[in-house]
């Protein structure tokens, strides 16, 4: 976790910092949003729990040619130990539910304040 | 209008536990994104952060203290209480509560002050 | 925990003058910077956050600036009603912590 951050800042940042990089896009996207984000594509609902890092990409790396979200995926690459490709389902999924991507990314930032605010940055 | 109102014993003797309450006018702990910070000033000294309670229970404290403090609230009451034990001479100081919203960013910016209660700590 | 240095302690500056007042961070804080007033007697306001963001109600004479570790807050023309201390503090992650302070007197 504490290579993360790099795209954005110059050498190692601590991990508290990278999840505020991460908190920090992810508002952007929700108030900069006008047209529907990613045209409406939907991906996987996913548990917020364990995992959940590598689920969250394991879900949006499926949808493609989405600038918006484009920076989002690189950044959870960097809290996802293992490297994911489209496709790829290994991480914990509810893989029964499809949702938005606008409302993916607002439950996402939801629970990422939350464990922000709580202290938990591993 | 948002205001917060300290209330405290005003005087505590050493070792001792400190029980202060913020009353929050104007505004609910119910509410999402709303937060509650106590911070302390000795006498002709600068501000030291405590602790904080946001809306759904999620608390945080300074370390150097945690051991010593709680912090909790009463949404029916609309009031945050903390609790400091094992009281000193040091621990004398205006205590403050204060308002801290997470909308968006969360900036940890406490925009509403009570206008503070002094505890002196003596025996 | 981040350290935050303020400097100067304490300044006398003339009704009209700039002021300025800087404030440094042990560690990259990301814009999560706060700056407070406190009058004498009184109870801290908040006057500037997120670096340069203002609350409603705050004077236009006031203004802050900085990245990274490095931030000032600007009184462009000091008024009389401006003695007070003023007070940085960082935001980026508890626990949340305050420079010393520094106290504006009017020459």
């Known amino acids: 976790l504490t290579c993360l951050g790099g795209f954005a800042s110059p050498g190692p940042v601590p991990p508290s910092t990278a999840l505020r990089e991460l908190i920090e896009e992810l508002v952007n996207i929700t108030q900069n949003q006008k047209a529907p984000l990613c045209n409406g594509s939907m991906v996987w609902s996913i548990n917020l729990t364990a995992g959940m890092y590598c689920a969250a990409l394991e879900s949006l790396i499926n949808v493609s040619g989405c600038s918006a979200i484009e920076k989002t995926q690189r950044m959870l690459s960097g809290f996802c130990p293992h490297k994911v490709s489209a496709g790829q389902f290994s991480s914990l999924h509810v893989r029964d539910t499809k949702i938005e991507v606008a409302q993916f990314v607002k439950d996402l930032l939801l629970h990422l304040k939350k464990l922000f605010r709580e202290g938990q940055f591993n | 209008e948002v205001t917060l109102r300290e209330s405290g014993p005003g005087l505590v003797k050493p070792t001792q536990t400190l029980t202060l309450t913020c009353t929050l006018y104007?505004?609910?702990?119910?509410?999402?994104?709303?937060?509650v910070d106590w911070i302390r000033q000795p006498p002709g000294k600068g501000l030291e952060w405590l602790a904080h309670?946001?809306?759904?229970?999620?608390?945080r404290y300074n370390p150097a203290l945690k051991s010593r403090l709680t912090i909790s609230k009463d949404t029916s009451k609309n009031q945050v209480v903390l609790k400091l034990t094992s009281v000193d001479p040091v621990d004398t100081a205006t205590y403050y509560c204060a308002r801290t919203v997470s909308s968006g960013y969360i900036y940890y910016a406490m925009d509403y002050w009570g206008q503070g209660t002094l505890v002196t700590v003596s025996s | 925990d981040i350290q935050m240095t303020q400097s100067p302690s304490s300044l006398s500056a003339s009704v009209g003058d700039r002021v300025t007042i800087s404030c440094r961070a042990s560690q990259d804080i990301r814009n999560y910077l706060n700056w407070y007033q406190q009058k004498p007697g009184k109870a801290p306001k908040l006057l500037i956050f997120y670096t340069s963001m203002k609350p409603r109600g705050v004077p236009s004479r006031f203004s802050g600036s900085g990245s990274g570790t490095d931030y000032t807050l600007t009184i462009s023309s000091l008024q009389p009603e401006d003695i007070a201390t003023y007070y940085c503090q960082q935001g980026l992650t508890p626990p949340l912590t305050f420079g010393g302070g520094t106290k504006v007197e009017i020459k």
């Open positions: 104007g505004f609910s702990l119910s509410t999402s994104d709303m937060g």
């Open positions: 309670i946001w809306w759904d229970d999620v608390k």
